[in-house]
């Protein structure tokens, strides 16, 4: 029986050109950790395997980058890392947790627009 | 502009069975990541189920995992969730919603009413 739950970081933003850690904690279970995948809605970003470590896929392996701990850190981010980003947790004996992180990129130029019509 | 219009809610017994239907108009329906959301009374709405714009990959929150499955019918540009073994924490306002690659969801359902009784 699945007793767990999984914790993120939830809806988060961040700029352009900057970098997010995304993040998931899995708790309320004794079950043993054996993987955990990172992927987007299309693809498969990376793998943390208990036994083998980290596995980044080629198309990602210049802008993120493993940890901290079970998380991920996205670098150099574009418009188009907009989206959302799933951790799955292989657990046994419990079987998978998915946790859900959906990330908006923000042009630069969003935070300098909103800053001119602050009234002082 | 897409406009989704969801079906398929109702009242059913505990350990039954529904099917939500979500049909797509005005848009390139196979462009779309769509997901289903359900908001119960006094809580905040939830993500329930992703499925790609490809259809190859589907996301479930764990709380209905196995027992909620997502799947899309491009020839008829509708998103279907199908529900069994329905509990009564099920019940909820469930919403169709849509989006872009590399956008919020932004195109949402009027939403259909689940009511799981004990």
């Known amino acids: 029986m699945m007793t767990g739950t999984i914790e993120t970081t939830g809806n988060i933003s961040a700029e352009k050109g900057g970098s997010i850690i995304l993040q998931c904690h899995l708790s309320s279970t004794t079950a043993q950790v054996t993987q955990v995948n990172w992927e987007q809605q299309d693809q498969l970003l990376a793998i943390c395997n208990a036994d083998l470590g980290w596995h980044i896929s080629p198309s990602f392996k210049d802008r993120v980058a493993p940890g901290p701990g079970l998380g991920l850190t996205l670098q150099s981010l574009t418009v188009n890392d907009t989206g959302e980003y799933f951790c799955i947790y292989h657990t046994y004996p419990d079987g998978t947790y998915t946790g859900r992180i959906f990330l908006e990129v923000l042009e630069s130029s969003v935070a300098e627009h909103g800053a001119r019509f602050q009234i002082p | 502009e897409v406009q989704l219009v969801e079906s398929g809610g109702g009242l059913v017994q505990a350990g039954g069975s529904l099917r939500l239907s979500c049909a797509a108009s005005?848009?390139?329906?196979?462009?779309?990541?769509m997901g289903w959301f359900r908001q119960a009374p006094g809580k905040e709405r939830e993500w329930v189920a992703t499925i790609n714009s490809s259809g190859s990959r589907t996301y479930y929150a764990d709380s209905v995992k196995g027992r909620f499955t997502i799947s899309a019918d491009n020839a008829k540009n509708t998103v279907y969730l199908q529900m069994n073994s329905l509990k009564p924490e099920d019940t909820a306002v469930y919403y169709c919603a849509a989006r872009p690659n590399y956008r919020d969801y932004e195109y949402w359902g009027q939403g259909t009413q689940v009511t799981v009784s004990s």
């Open positions: 005005g848009g390139t329906f196979r462009s779309y990541v």
